[in-house]
């Protein structure tokens, strides 16, 4: 059998391999050692017994999408049946005091590979033996502690494979410089050590994407905006736009990045080198926001100009696949730069909202029949912008951290936006009061510290804004 017979549904073409050469990966036309690494089709009954106590699940993730030329990283995590985990020596053990369907286990080990490797014979002086090899026959790398690595991972994409010895989690990074743009498929097969051979325990696949567009995300936030995710914002208050470039391999770290904004409100283009920008809309309505991100990134060098047509210059002929796989134009080994672009577009709605709220007066209400240890206080509040429909007060300790009381109530306010909010305080002392006015789209907050005196008729109320 060959690798493509084992790892994929269909034999990839040489064309695919030649056009997507991955550094350090091998052609899936290579032979697979089926004696050491048995191959089971989907639905084979042997899968049921490939792992003691249930099935192992492999979870494959990647930091896709990847900007072409950058590195994309794949991570495989093995999820063991309930109550099982990998210990420091790479053995699989039962978790202490964990009960699964089989109850508590007397044997602490699910797989005691340390014992197996110590019993193993047929080794030469280097600690290498005929079974410490990958499916293509290459020997395992002897990193320190490699004996504690009991899983073999075979990654397969674009007609090529990569083998890795590891523990219950491995990561592999691939440079995408030669990868065709668009969605691609990564498949991973995982084997576990089994005496002097290996047993398949899991297979997983995931789609990843290589793009020549910078992946761009924009977060939009605004003070007093009630719901930051509905793309509805308030007139006359600055909106903060924060651009996040998805670049997990730091490919663009040394690039100069320019942000070109069009806010859709006839304010023209705004060019910035800062990833954060503020903009205030002064009219209500719907606006089309456009962002273009430009970065000078490492990229392919243009081919040299072709030689003059006559006399024809001999060019190396294209040999069989593998000799000179691409017959490429000579690409100089220079550090060339190429402008990469990313785009973001959003439609945002601008509406009236409560822009500001202020407490302009605080008055102690003298009660005819004072309650035991209770004070009533009136807060006179003004606001700007739209008319609020509700008021909330949160009374907490002086640090404003421990809430003691929260009350919300509807309000009916005139155009002047002047209202009085009455609240009760239990006992004397200093309180933090958070007062918010809200409507459908906005929520405006103000805070104050007040001192409630003892119930002594001579005492007065103090407020510190």
């Amino acid at each position: 059998k060959r690798f493509h017979d084992v790892l994929g549904n269909e034999r990839p073409s040489a064309y695919m391999r030649e056009h997507n050469q991955l550094n350090g990966w091998s052609s899936d036309e290579n032979d697979w050692n089926e004696k050491l690494y048995p191959v089971w089709k989907r639905g084979d009954m042997r899968w049921k017994n490939s792992w003691k106590g249930g099935r192992v699940q492999a979870v494959l993730t990647s930091d896709s999408p990847a900007l072409v030329g950058s590195n994309i990283t794949f991570v495989v995590n093995l999820v063991f049946p309930r109550c099982q985990k990998e210990d420091a020596n790479g053995n699989i053990v039962y978790e202490k005091n964990c009960r699964n369907e089989a109850g508590l286990s007397a044997d602490p080990y699910v797989y005691n590979w340390t014992a197996w490797s110590e019993d193993s014979d047929g080794e030469n002086g280097t600690g290498q033996s005929h079974h410490n090899v990958f499916p293509d026959g290459k020997p395992f790398p002897h990193h320190p502690g490699w004996r504690r690595w009991n899983f073999v991972y075979v990654f397969h994409t674009l007609g090529q494979y990569f083998q890795k010895l590891g523990r219950c989690s491995v990561r592999v990074s691939v440079n995408t410089a030669n990868v065709t743009l668009g969605p691609q498929l990564m498949e991973v097969t995982v084997y576990r050590r089994h005496g002097r051979a290996y047993v398949p325990i899991a297979q997983v696949k995931d789609v990843y994407v290589v793009t020549d567009q910078i992946p761009v995300f924009v977060t939009m936030s605004q003070k007093n905006d009630r719901n930051s995710s509905d793309e509805t914002f308030l007139k006359d208050l600055p909106i903060t736009f924060d651009v996040l470039i998805h670049d997990p391999s730091h490919f663009l770290n040394y690039s100069t990045i320019n942000y070109k904004w069009s806010f859709g409100d006839n304010t023209g283009l705004f060019v910035s080198i800062n990833h954060t920008v503020n903009h205030t809309y002064v009219l209500n309505g719907t606006f089309s926001l456009n962002l273009t991100v430009k970065a000078a990134a490492p990229g392919p060098c243009p081919p040299p100009p072709p030689p003059p047509p006559r006399p024809p210059k001999p060019t190396p002929s294209l040999g069989p696949a593998g000799d000179n796989p691409l017959g490429l134009s000579e690409i100089p080994d220079e550090n060339c730069q190429i402008n990469r672009y990313g785009h973001f577009q959003a439609t945002i709605t601008i509406v009236e909202g409560i822009l500001e709220v202020n407490i302009i007066q605080t008055t102690d209400v003298l009660m005819l029949v004072p309650g035991p240890d209770s004070s009533l206080i009136d807060f006179v509040v003004t606001c700007q912008g739209s008319i609020p429909t509700e008021v909330c007060t949160i009374i907490s300790d002086p640090t404003c951290e421990i809430t003691q009381n929260a009350v919300c109530s509807p309000v009916d306010v005139d155009e002047m936006c002047l209202l009085t909010v009455r609240r009760a305080f239990n006992g004397s002392g200093t309180y933090c009061v958070n007062l918010t006015l809200g409507d459908d789209t906005s929520l405006a907050l103000t805070s104050t510290l007040i001192s409630v005196p003892d119930r002594d008729p001579a005492s007065s109320l103090r407020m510190a804004n």
Epitope: R11, S13, Y15, H19, D212, L318
Partner: antibody, heavy 119, light 107 residues
Framework: QVQLVQSGAEVKKPGASVKVSCKAS????????MHWVRQAPGQGLEWMGE????????NYAQKFQGRVTMTVDKSTSTVYMELSSLRSEDTAVYYC????????????WGQGTLVTVSS | DIVMTQSPDSLAVSLGERATINCKTS??????LAWYQQKPGQPPKLLIY???KRYTGVPDRFSGSGSGTDFTLTISSLQAEDVAVYYC?????????FGGGTKVEIK
């Protein structure tokens, strides 16, 4: 929808050069290799070579090495095929064809450009 | 280079009858083989790719089969609009190659 529009017919003298253009639209131009295939009158199809618009890597059939040059203008999403030292047997319809991802089969073809080489 | 041998050169079949075209490659290209239909004055039209996968919009009377070095295009019930030249193409490796073509006519 994907469209490949080629330049018009050409009549050339032996020894001259011809440059045929193929303007692409309806897809991300840099994402797919573009190929050139020719067909002499009453004959079969013959693959000439390919170019990657993203990095301008080229790959030519041995028969055309040294005589063919494929180039790209990303700003106009256009691929060019120039064939030099023309001879009468180069009289043919020249097609551009777009491959599909990592697969070199052609679902999209230009309408063809007839190049006639005659003294 | 891979050599493509297509047979027969021409084929006359009655309307509604089955037409079978063969394509042999000099080395294993499985499953990277495509079939095209070409009518006079038009570019080729993709029918089948990867030996047996029918391209979008292609009538199901067209089917592809085969593996290794031997491949077949079958038109299960020939229609008048199927009169054309049919080409196979290996898309396994570069240089890409086409078969010599098979002309299908109505008997």
């Amino acid at each position: 929808q994907v469209q490949l529009v080629q330049s018009g017919a050409e009549v050339k003298k032996p020894g001259a050069s011809v440059k045929v253009s193929c303007k692409a639209s309806g897809y991300t131009f840099t994402s797919y290799w573009m190929h050139w295939v020719r067909q002499a009158p009453g004959q079969g199809l013959e693959w000439m070579g390919e170019i990657n618009p993203y990095d301008q890597r080229t790959n030519y059939a041995q028969k055309f090495q040294g005589r063919v040059t494929m180039t790209v203008d990303k700003s106009t999403s256009t691929v060019y095929m120039e064939l030099s030292s023309l001879r009468s047997e180069d009289t043919a319809v020249y097609y551009c064809a777009r491959s599909t991802g990592n697969y070199a089969w052609f679902a999209y073809w230009g309408q063809g450009t007839l190049v006639t080489v005659s003294s | 280079d891979i050599v493509m041998t297509q047979s027969p050169d021409s084929l006359a079949v009655s309307l509604g009858e089955r037409a079978t075209i063969n394509c042999k490659t000099s080395q294993d290209v499985s499953p990277s083989l495509a079939w095209y239909q070409q009518k006079p004055g038009q570019p080729p039209k993709l029918l089948i790719y990867s030996a047996s996968k029918r391209y979008t919009g292609v009538p199901d009377r067209f089917s592809g089969s085969g593996s290794g070095t031997d491949f077949t295009l079958t038109i299960s019930s020939l229609q008048a609009e199927d009169v054309a030249v049919y080409y196979c193409q290996q898309h396994y490796s570069i240089p890409l190659q086409f078969g010599g073509g098979t002309k299908v006519e109505i008997k």
